[in-house]
């Protein structure tokens, strides 16, 4: 064993924004300090096989797996990568130790698995096993598709950056508003990534893949609907791509569209026209406008125009980051136990949101519509009555937004009773919180008619669970009320309810309901 | 600084079964990557098997593998071994290992940073 080589394997993990890796494989750029994989020599196997800690990689990022190696005079390898051998360009570092790299860019399902390295020195032959893993199938993405025109086509495609690769399909419907909805008859779903008929009312690109599915709709201004009371506004973040279609019918081909930003015309290469003729004989235009890779001077009002239509504009707003726009102060409802209600948030944000309702430690799924004036609103209707703490989270790749309700429902108090050899307990959880009263019965006073006033303590809003109040009060148990039944009551502007208790010696006590 | 206890072991027929459990206290428990060594008499201590720190991806021995499985609790700090058909050369003392990172997997012993005191595990008719 003294001829073996000393080697070291190390992990190097680059920082996404590393632009240096790869641009050399021999020379790739540390990015944090390398993580020893503490090759080990593999008992039992035929041959000289060195064995590297199994390295875990985050879906989309870049590593480098490094071997230095501690041998006298030159030495050739060869890297060997699901039965496909790989270039391998050994050199030397300031220690005369032979380096070897491999860079793994952007870590994908398919770059997982087994690396051997084959390495030939002066005095021997030897293997290095690496097992390189996706770090966590939690890690798996799901990324909004967005759109691209198809080169020197007439066409969009639609692309989703997402892992595992998600199934894309397009949403078409030619109705109008609410006939719209997913599973409408109108709608026309059609799997593949390119779509040519782009005439439709409504077009939106779906992506899906093992965490859930996220739509993009194509934005549109139609010329001859008409114009929403407030202007409809169009969010992106700086690098996104700007799609907006201008749509228009006319009875003859007599007629053009043009798109300006800010009262000036678009470049050329920011647009283009497509036409076709409806079934009626009328004539259907659009104009899209795009922009490959928007920066902060493309904000503004994008304006159609048409000879034979009055313009409509959209107002792009381009954002550094994504944003949820709400307000989180916490609200408080009271209603009656049959009372029709649902708590809602009204809310504007891009990227669109994800959100859940919960209650009692358990969600709720959450919808979301968008109004007319570009904000959105969710609603919870399922309270079932049950008082307490209701919780509105949202979230989307910048930004998380938490809102808190609470419900109480008027009701006349419950009572309930415990008692211990020294104090009697009652609670109760009514709404408007109870006031408490305790009563002594005795031959003096057989209706209970007595009041205690002595050793009573009063604790509101002792406990809350999930939000919901309890009330309770406590009497100690005094030489003058041993041996006497007592009764303590609650009451609130709904009713009073009360629990009769026996304070004898210790033991189990039995309570007489009394309502 | 983590420590790490072992549990369960004993004497056991071939053929037959076995769990152990690692209790981990101090640093977070997840946030690090765990497995199992074991060490005969007279031998070397071999890598058994291992887990991530998030429990998606598990490695085995090739001396163990269909027979042994690894699992975690995060909620509970704990890590175990369970141990079907058990062979005579399954005989060892046992090793909880905790690494250091969550990148990289305790699948060799020079990147353990912490071990447990062992369990000796006994297989015999």
């Known amino acids: 064993n003294q001829d073996l080589p000393v080697i070291k394997c190390v992990l190097i993990n680059h920082k996404n924004n590393d632009s240096s890796v790869g641009k050399s494989s021999s020379y790739p750029m540390v990015s944090e300090s390398p993580e020893d994989l503490g090759c080990a020599l593999r008992p039992q196997s035929s041959g000289t096989v060195y064995e590297a800690a199994a390295v875990e990689v985050d879906v989309s990022a870049s590593i480098t797996l490094q071997v230095l190696v501690d041998a006298p005079g030159n030495i050739s390898c060869l890297w060997v990568f699901k039965h496909s051998s790989l270039n391998c360009q050994p050199h030397f570092d300031l220690q005369n130790r032979g380096v070897v790299s491999m860079v793994i860019l952007k870590m994908t399902e398919t770059q997982a698995g087994e690396y051997l390295l084959f390495i030939q020195s002066e005095a021997t032959n030897y293997t290095i096993l690496f097992t390189v893993s996706i770090r966590n199938t939690l890690l798996y993405t799901l990324r909004r598709p967005y759109f691209r025109k198809m080169e020197n086509q007439d066409a969009l495609v639609c692309i989703s950056e997402s892992v595992p690769e998600p199934i894309v399909e397009w949403v078409l419907c030619d109705s109008q508003g609410e006939s719209c909805k997913e599973e409408s008859p109108a709608v026309v779903k059609k799997e593949e990534k390119v779509l040519h008929e782009l005439f439709g009312t409504d077009i939106r690109c779906c992506a899906r893949n093992e965490l859930g599915r996220e739509c993009t709709r194509l934005f549109t201004i139609d010329l001859n609907q008409t114009p929403q009371t407030t202007l409809p506004q169009l969010f992106l973040k700086v690098g996104e791509p700007l799609w907006i279609r201008c749509k228009a019918v006319h009875v003859n081909h007599g007629f053009g569209l043009t798109w300006e930003l800010e009262n000036k015309a678009l470049e050329e290469g920011n647009y283009f026209e497509m036409s076709t003729y409806s079934t009626n004989r009328t004539m259907i235009r659009i104009l899209f406008a795009f922009v490959s890779s928007v920066a902060r001077n493309d904000t503004g009002y994008y304006t159609c125009s048409s000879s034979k239509h009055p313009s409509q504009s959209a107002l792009v707003t381009i954002v550094e980051k994504g944003f949820i726009n709400a307000t989180n102060s916490s609200e408080d409802y009271e209603i009656d136990q049959y009372e029709e209600f649902c708590f809602s948030v009204r809310f504007k944000a891009y990227p669109q949101i994800r959100c859940t309702w919960t209650f009692s430690r358990k969600s709720f799924p959450c919808e979301q519509k968008g109004l007319d004036n570009g904000y959105s609103i969710s609603k919870f209707c399922n309270h079932k009555h049950q008082p307490g703490e209701y919780i509105f989270h949202a979230e989307n790749d910048d930004a998380q937004f938490t809102k808190m309700f609470t419900l109480n429902i008027r009701r006349k108090p419950q009572v309930l009773a415990e008692a211990s050899a020294s104090q009697a307990s009652c609670f109760s959880d009514g709404y408007p919180l109870p006031s408490w009263t305790w009563k002594k019965c005795s031959d003096k006073s057989p209706n209970c008619t007595e009041e205690i006033t002595e050793g009573v303590w009063n604790r509101k809003a002792n406990r809350k669970v999930f939000g919901q109040w309890v009330s309770s009060s406590t009497l100690n148990m005094s030489e003058a009320i041993k041996g006497f039944l007592v009764k303590c009551c609650a009451y609130n502007s709904l009713g009073t309810s009360c629990e009769t208790i026996l304070l004898n010696s210790p033991g189990p006590f039995p309570f007489i309901q009394d309502n | 600084e983590v420590q790490l206890l072992e549990s369960g072991g004993g004497l056991v027929q071939p053929g037959g079964s076995l769990t152990l459990s690692c209790a981990a206290s101090g640093r977070t428990f997840s946030s690090y990557a765990m497995g199992w060594f074991r060490q005969a008499p007279g031998k070397e201590r071999e890598f058994v098997a291992a887990?991530?720190?998030?429990?998606?991806?598990?490695y085995y021995a090739d001396s163990v593998k269909g027979r042994f499985t690894i699992s975690r609790d995060n909620s509970k700090n704990t890590l175990y071994l369970q141990m079907n058909s058990l062979r005579a050369e399954d005989t060892a003392v046992y090793y909880c290992a905790a690494g250091g990172s969550t990148r990289v997997v305790v699948t060799t012993t020079p990147v353990v940073k912490y071990w447990g005191q062992g369990t000796l595990v006994t297989v015999s008719s």
């Open positions: 887990i991530s720190w998030s429990g998606s991806n598990t």
